[in-house]
Structure formats: structure tokens, C-alpha cells
């Protein structure tokens, strides 16, 4: 499965949609910025087999999809952009799932790195907690949008590293 080819374009499209979703000036939200502790070490990728790497990417995209599928999200973002973004994420999830299935039998190692997936889950829990504490304010969502863009950019680098490994 040539993951990066199918996935990189989708990742770029998702990033562009996220960029377009901004509704308020981020400069009015400087005081709301927060360190969510992105699990960078899980995206360094050296210790992973390909199927494990794909499962971590899948978890990140699944969690992003869940986050932007909430009613609070629908109340914040422009509907047509949100729908396009969700469709893009859904397509990426399908691509990744197909990839994982192809990798079964190719590798002897377990399909999932449980610790890495847990780290990604906890990262998104911190994001959700922050939004709750900030009462889903426009600035809180703006901070989260920037964080997700940053994490997508980092996962893009991760995918490029996977491509080089191939």
C-alpha cells in the first residue's frame, strides 16, 4: 500500500480547509493559547513498523473527526467548510483502513502500538477538557484549530519519512 501517495494530498486538502475555517482574528486569542502536549515521540516513526505507524495516523485522524463532529463544533464553524473537512477526514480514514488490511500478513509485528494510540487519545482528551473549561468559546476553538493544524503538519512530516523508508 502506497500510503503517503494516497494520504499526503488528502492531508494537504484538510490543512487548507482548516486554514479557511478561521472566523476570528487569532491575535485576539493570544492569552488563550495552551500547551496540549502533542505526543511528538509517537510521530518520530523510527521504532514503528509500517502498520503500526498507519494505526497511529488513523487514531489521530479519527480523534480529529470526532472532535469536529460535535454539536459544539457545528455551532462554531461555517457549515459547508466543516462538511468538506469531515468528508476529507472520512476519506483519509478509509484509505488508512485499506492500507492496514493490506499490511496484514506482510509484517510479523502487532498491528497496533497500544501505548502510542493511548498517547494520542490522551492528547485529544486534553484538547476536549480545555474546550470544556473554556466553555467552547470562539477563542478556545481558534486555539484548537491552530493546534490541529500544527499536529497535521507534523503528521505530514511523519508520512514523508514513511515514504522515504519505503
Amino acid at each position: 500500500c502506497d500510503l503517503p501517495q494516497t494520504h499526503s494530498l488528502g492531508n494537504r486538502r484538510a490543512l487548507i480547509l482548516l486554514a479557511q475555517m478561521g472566523r476570528i482574528s487569532p491575535f485576539s486569542c493570544l492569552k488563550d493559547r495552551h500547551d496540549f502536549g502533542f505526543p511528538q515521540e509517537e510521530f518520530d516513526g523510527n521504532q514503528f513498523q509500517k502498520a503500526q505507524a498507519i494505526s497511529v495516523l488513523h487514531e489521530m485522524i479519527q480523534q480529529t473527526f470526532n472532535l469536529f463532529s460535535t454539536k459544539d463544533s457545528s455551532a462554531t464553524w461555517e457549515q459547508s467548510l466543516l462538511e468538506k473537512f469531515s468528508t476529507e477526514l472520512n476519506q483519509q480514514l478509509n484509505d488508512l483502513e485499506a492500507c492496514v488490511i493490506q499490511e496484514v500478513g506482510v509484517e510479523e509485528t502487532p498491528l497496533m502500538n497500544v501505548d502510542s494510540i493511548l498517547a494520542v487519545k490522551k492528547y485529544f482528551q486534553r484538547i476536549t477538557l480545555y474546550l470544556t473549561e473554556k466553555k467552547y468559546s470562539p477563542c478556545a476553538w481558534e486555539v484548537v484549530r491552530a493546534e490541529i493544524m500544527r499536529s497535521f503538519s507534523l503528521s505530514k512530516i511523519f508520512q514523508e519519512r514513511l515514504r522515504r523508508k519505503e
Epitope: 494537504r12 490543512l15 487548507i16 486554514a19 479557511q20 478561521g22 482574528s25 487569532p26 491575535f27 486569542c29 493570544l30 492569552k31 493559547r33 495552551h34 500547551d35 502536549g37 486555539v143 491552530a146 493546534e147 493544524m149 500544527r150
Partner: antibody, heavy 120, light 111 residues
């Protein structure tokens, strides 16, 4: 690769206006904020303001609010800064710089600078 | 506006030794786990180059002899061991609040 190409040296009279350009290539111009920074000869750096080419949203350093006007033309992948009512204090090198890491607001790529000389 | 005071204004360090540059902010630039202080290097006739972001994160491609530390109002850039090519002016910049400001610069000379 990412490049920011700025317009050449400008010589202007006091009281006049100048408009400089910054042509971006090698990345998605509409999805990165673009900062402008001033550097007077032998001196430090001053942040002028920032523009988001995707929607034209701008934020200024209050000190430059009545001095600088930032615009962008997405079809040309070009950002512009117009300086008005020029005085000797405006003689400087002006850099356009790409915002980096989203809301960390650092600057990773810099144009080569446009030199503005104000003289009668 | 937050004022960034860099010290010393200039320093001369022998090849292979340690250079330490300080940047003090008039108000805290740290919030919720991040310190919004960044460091740049500018060589004569060149544009500034990002070295360190968020006080201690090394920018990709920057040699590991550069390191940053600090939080709140006090920040430090260390270069060890210093090499000839490190002769430049170093600036700190904060993005804690508007307007973003830069320090006045520290000129590093290699002995």
C-alpha cells in the same frame, strides 16, 4: 523551496508614499500569515504588522497603524506594504517574513529586504 | 509594550568556548506551558535566521551547539562550542502579546 522575493531599493521624498512588494513561491500563499519587519541601519528589528492573504485580515503594531498599510493579491501570490507620509525615520530595510508554527508566531523564511531611503 | 533587554550588547568568545546571551522581558511571556520567546541569528548583510522557538526548541537544520532555556521573564541562548561561523548578531523576539517586539541584539565576535 520556499522563497520570498522583495522589490528593489526605493528612493523617495519626504511626505511621499511608497509601495513595496513581496512575491511568495514554494508554498500555499493563502494559508500562512505574512509579517513585515523594519530594520534601520545598524539597529535592531521592529515588528510592523501581519496579514493573512487568505482573507486579507490584518493586525498592526499600533506604532505603525497610520504609517503602514498591508495588502495581498492572492492571484499573484504577492503581499504589499505601503508606507505613507515618509520621513527620514522611515529610511530602513523592510522585510516580509512568513509566519511559522501557526500561533507560536515565529518567522521562518525572510525576503531579502527592500531598502527605502527618504531624502530631499 | 513588552520591552526585551538583551545583555551583553556585545561579547567576544574564544573558538570552542561557550557564549551565553541573556534576554529579559519586562513582563512574562509564558502562558499555559509555553514560553513565547524565540531567537534569531543575523550575519552582516544577511536576513535573520530562526534558531530557537518557544524558548528551547531547536529549529530544524540548526546545529545542536545552539540551545535555549528560560521561562517567564528570563531567557538564555547558549552556543557551545562556539565556531567561527557563529560570528553574528543575535536577537530575541517574543510573541506573548501584541505588539511582538525584538531585543536590541547582541553582537558575538569570535576571538
Amino acid at each position: 523551496q520556499v522563497q520570498l522575493q522583495e522589490s528593489g531599493t526605493v528612493l523617495a521624498r519626504p511626505g511621499a508614499s511608497v509601495k513595496m512588494s513581496c512575491k511568495a513561491s514554494g508554498y500555499s500563499f493563502t494559508t500562512y500569515w505574512m509579517h513585515w519587519v523594519k530594520q534601520r541601519p545598524g539597529q535592531g528589528l521592529e515588528w510592523i504588522g501581519v496579514i493573512y492573504p487568505g482573507n486579507g485580515d490584518t493586525t498592526y503594531n499600533q506604532k505603525f497603524k497610520d504609517k503602514a498599510k498591508l495588502t495581498a493579491v492572492t492571484s499573484a501570490n504577492t503581499a504589499y506594504m505601503e508606507l505613507s507620509s515618509l520621513t527620514n525615520e522611515d529610511s530602513a530595510v523592510y522585510f516580509c517574513t512568513r509566519n511559522y508554527k501557526y500561533d507560536y508566531y515565529t518567522m521562518d523564511y525572510w525576503g531579502q529586504g527592500t531598502t527605502v531611503t527618504v531624502s530631499s | 509594550d513588552i520591552v526585551l533587554t538583551q545583555s551583553p550588547a556585545s561579547l567576544a568568545v574564544s573558538l570552542g568556548q561557550r557564549a551565553t546571551i541573556s534576554c529579559r522581558a519586562s513582563k512574562s511571556v509564558s502562558t499555559s506551558g509555553h514560553s513565547y520567546m524565540h531567537w534569531y541569528q543575523q550575519k552582516p548583510g544577511q536576513t535573520p535566521k530562526l534558531l530557537i522557538y518557544l524558548a528551547s526548541n531547536l529549529e530544524s537544520g540548526v546545529p545542536a551547539r545552539f540551545s535555549g532555556s528560560g521561562s517567564g521573564t528570563d531567557f538564555t541562548l547558549n552556543i557551545h562550542p562556539v565556531e567561527e561561523e557563529d560570528a553574528a548578531t543575535y536577537y530575541c523576539q517574543h510573541s506573548g502579546e501584541l505588539p511582538f517586539t525584538f531585543g536590541s541584539g547582541t553582537k558575538l565576535e569570535i576571538k
